[in-house]
C-alpha cells in the first residue's frame, strides 16, 4: 500500500470541470467523495496545520540547542523529518479532491507519495537511535560519559538518513502515472509490472523493517529501561524518557492500520470484496499514518504542561524546557557533561 | 514481454453468442485496461468497448446492449462476449492493452477472425 | 458520439516524398485538466494488427520514425511523414480517447 494509489482507486469516471461543454462525458458515478476520502481530507488539513507550525516551532528551539544538547539533536533530526513529510500535504490533498487526478507529474508522483516512507524509516530509525541512546545512559554510564557527544550523535543520525533513504527507494522506483477513464484522469500509483513476489516483498520488508522488528526491539528496550528506572525509585525527572516513550508508542499506533491494510493488500486478490474494500480505505490510512508528522509537537506541550504543572511559560520556553534536558556539552572528544553530575543521579535522570 | 494472445470461435451461427477471451503476460490487469477493437472486411477500425483496471467498464454505445466485457486477475485473462450476433458482425476482433498515457493502444491481440453464418 | 473525419480516404506518393494528412473532430479533444489533445495516430498494415503511432496529438511512441510528426490542437490534427518509405504503405488510422472512442475512417497510402 504505497501511499495513495496502490492500485487504481475505483471512482469512476467525472467530468472534466473546466470544461463547461453539453457534449462532455456525464459522470457516470457520483462526483462526491466517499466517507473515507473526506474524512482523509479533515486529517489532513489538521496534519497539515499542526505539523508544519509545530514541527517548524521545535526545529526553531532545538536547532540553537543542537550545538550543546545531544537531546535536542535528536528531537531536531525529528522535526525535520516529520516537516518534510508535512510539506507534500498539499499535494495529495488536492490530489484526493479532484477524485485521485494527479495533475503534478511523474516526477512528483515518485517523490511526494514517498515521503510519508521516507519519514516513516527516518523516524523508526531516529527513536532506535535515541532509545539506544536512552539505552546506554541508563546500563552504560561510564561509557557515555566518555563517549557520548554531539559528533556522534549527528553521525548515527546521519546513518539513519542514509538507511532511511535506501529503504525508500523501492517505492519511489515502482511509483508511476498513468491515464484511464474517460475524460482521461492521471493516477498516480504504483506498478510492480505484474511481479506478485516482487510486491509482496516489498510489503513484507517494510513491515518487518518499518514496524514489526523496531516494535519488537524498542520494547525489549523499553522494558529494560523502565525496570532499571523504576528498581532505582528515580526521583529526579523521567521527562525525556516519557516523552520518548510517548512517541514511540504513537509511532506504532498510527502506522498499525496502514502496515495491516498494506500487508493484506498484497497477499490478496485484486478482485476479491476485502481487496476492494481496504483499496476504498488505502487515503484514511495513509492519513492517519501521517498524524504521526504533527503528534510530536503535541506531546511535547503536553509533556511541558505537565512538568510544568499549567502552560505558564511561553511555547518555545515549554518546548525547550522538554527537548533540551542536557545542558552543555563540553567540547571535547572524549568527555561530555550532562544535566547532572554524579553518575548514580545521572542514571535517575532518564 | 508484453503479449496478448486471443483465443475463440471462427465461426459464430446467427442470433448466437460470441465469447473471445484475451490472455495477457508481461503486465497486470490491475494496473492497464484492456479495449476491444474489431474490423469488418475492407472496412475500418471500430472501437467496442474498454475493461479499466479497477474493473469497471465502457462500451461503445452501440452496442451497450448486448456486449460485457470482464476480467479474471489471477489469470490475466479478459473476457469478450457479445449477444445476438448478426451477418454485418463478421470482423475480425482485436483485444489491445491501455498504454500508460494518452489513453492509447500500445499493444494489440493478433486478432480473432470472426465468421457469422449459419 | 465524437465523429472523427479523415481526408484524404486515399494518397498516392512517391518514396521519399513528404505526405501530410488530415484529421478533424466534431468537438474539441483537448482536455483542461490535463492539458492534452487526445488524439491517436495509428499504422495498419494488411493482415496485421494495428500499431501506436502518435498519442497526445504530437507525441511519438517510442521506437517510431522520427520522420512521423503529430500536430494539431483542440479540432483540427495532422500527421506528417517527412520523408516516406516503401514499409510506410499502410492505412492510418486517427482516434479520439477524450469522450469514449472513435475511430477515423482511415487513410490509405498506396505507390
Known amino acids: 500500500m504505497d501511499s495513495f494509489n496502490y492500485t487504481t482507486p475505483d471512482y469512476g469516471h467525472y467530468d472534466d470541470k473546466d470544461t463547461l461543454d453539453l457534449n462532455t462525458p456525464v459522470d457516470k458515478t457520483s462526483n462526491t467523495l466517499r466517507v473515507p476520502d473526506i474524512l482523509a481530507l479533515v486529517i489532513f488539513a489538521v496534519v497539515f496545520l499542526v505539523g508544519v507550525l509545530g514541527n517548524a516551532l521545535v526545529v526553531w528551539v532545538t536547532a540553537f540547542e543542537a550545538k550543546r544538547t545531544i537531546n535536542a539533536i535528536w528531537f531536531l533530526n525529528l522535526a525535520v523529518a516529520d516537516f518534510l513529510s508535512c510539506l507534500a500535504l498539499p499535494i495529495l490533498f488536492t490530489s484526493i479532491v479532484q477524485h485521485h487526478h494527479w495533475p503534478f507529474g511523474g516526477a512528483a508522483c515518485s517523490i511526494l507519495p514517498s515521503l510519508i516512507l521516507l519519514n516513516m524509516y527516518a523516524s523508526i530509525l531516529l527513536l532506535a537511535t535515541i532509545s539506544a541512546d536512552r539505552f546506554l545512559l541508563v546500563f552504560k554510564p561510564i561509557w557515555c560519559q566518555n563517549f557520548r557527544g554531539a559528533g556522534l550523535a549527528w553521525i548515527a543520525c546521519a546513518v539513519a538518513w542514509g538507511l532511511a533513504l535506501l529503504l525508500t527507494i523501492p517505492s519511489f522506483l515502482y511509483r508511476v502515472v498513468r491515464e484511464e477513464y474517460f475524460p482521461p484522469k492521471v493516477l498516480c500509483g504504483v506498478d510492480y509490472s505484474h511481479d506478485k513476489r516482487r510486491e509482496r516483498a516489498v510489503a513484507i520488508v517494510r513491515l518487518v523493517l518499518g514496524f514489526l522488528w523496531p516494535l519488537l526491539t524498542l520494547t525489549i528496550c523499553y522494558t529494560f529501561i523502565l525496570l532499571r528506572t523504576w528498581s532505582r525509585r528515580a526521583t529526579r525527572s523521567t521527562k525525556t524518557l516519557k516523552v520518548v516513550v510517548a512517541v514511540v508508542a504513537s509511532f506504532f499506533i498510527f502506522w498499525l492500520p496502514y502496515q495491516v491494510t498494506g500487508i493484506m493488500m498484497s497477499f490478496l486478490e485484486p478482485s476479491s470484496p476485502t481487496f476492494l474494500l481496504l483499496k476504498k480505505l488505502d487515503s484514511l490510512c495513509v492519513s492517519f499514518a501521517y498524524i504521526n508528522c504533527c503528534i510530536n509537537p503535541i506531546i511535547y506541550v503536553v509533556a511541558g504542561q505537565g512538568f510544568q504543572g499549567r502552560l505558564r511559560k511561553s511555547l518555545p520556553s515549554l518546548l525547550r524546557n522538554v527537548l533540551t534536558e542536557e545542558s552543555v556539552v563540553r567540547e571535547s572528544k572524549s568527555f561530555t557533561r550532562s544535566t547532572v553530575d554524579t553518575m548514580a543521579q545521572k542514571t535517575q535522570a532518564v | 514481454q508484453v503479449q496478448l494472445k486471443q483465443s475463440g470461435p471462427g465461426q459464430v451461427a446467427p442470433s448466437q453468442s460470441l465469447s473471445i477471451t484475451c490472455t495477457v503476460s508481461?503486465?497486470?490487469?490491475?494496473?492497464?485496461?484492456v479495449h476491444w477493437v474489431r474490423q469488418s472486411p475492407g472496412k475500418g477500425l471500430e472501437w467496442l468497448g474498454v475493461?479499466?483496471?479497477?474493473?469497471?467498464?465502457d462500451y461503445n454505445t452501440a452496442f451497450i446492449s448486448r456486449l460485457s466485457i470482464s476480467r479474471d486477475n489471477s489469470k490475466s485473462q479478459v473476457f469478450f462476449k457479445m449477444r445476438s450476433l448478426q451477418v454485418d458482425d463478421t470482423a475480425v476482433y482485436y483485444c489491445?492493452?491501455?498504454?500508460?498515457?494518452?489513453?492509447?493502444?500500445?499493444?494489440w491481440g493478433q486478432g480473432t477472425s470472426v465468421t457469422v453464418s449459419s | 458520439d465524437i465523429v472523427m473525419t479523415q481526408s484524404p480516404s486515399s494518397l498516392a506518393v512517391s518514396v521519399g516524398e513528404k505526405v501530410t494528412m488530415s484529421c478533424k473532430s466534431s468537438?474539441?479533444?483537448?482536455?483542461?485538466?490535463?492539458?492534452?489533445?487526445?488524439l491517436a495516430w495509428y499504422q495498419q498494415k494488411p493482415g496485421q494488427s494495428p500499431k501506436l503511432l502518435i498519442y497526445?496529438?504530437?507525441t511519438r511512441e517510442s521506437g517510431v520514425p522520427y520522420r512521423f510528426t503529430g500536430s494539431g490542437s483542440g479540432t483540427d490534427f495532422t500527421l506528417t511523414i517527412s520523408s516516406v518509405q516503401t514499409e510506410d504503405l499502410a492505412v492510418y488510422y486517427c482516434?479520439?480517447?477524450?469522450?469514449?472512442?472513435?475511430f477515423g475512417a482511415g487513410t490509405k497510402l498506396e505507390l
Open positions: 489491445a492493452r491501455n498504454g500508460r498515457l494518452g489513453n492509447a493502444m500500445d499493444y
Open positions: 508481461g503486465f497486470s490487469l490491475i494496473n492497464s485496461a
Open positions: 475493461i479499466w483496471s479497477d474493473g469497471s467498464t
Open positions: 468537438q474539441s479533444l483537448f482536455s483542461s485538466r490535463t492539458r492534452k489533445n487526445y
Open positions: 497526445w496529438a504530437s
Open positions: 482516434k479520439q480517447s477524450y469522450n469514449l472512442l472513435t
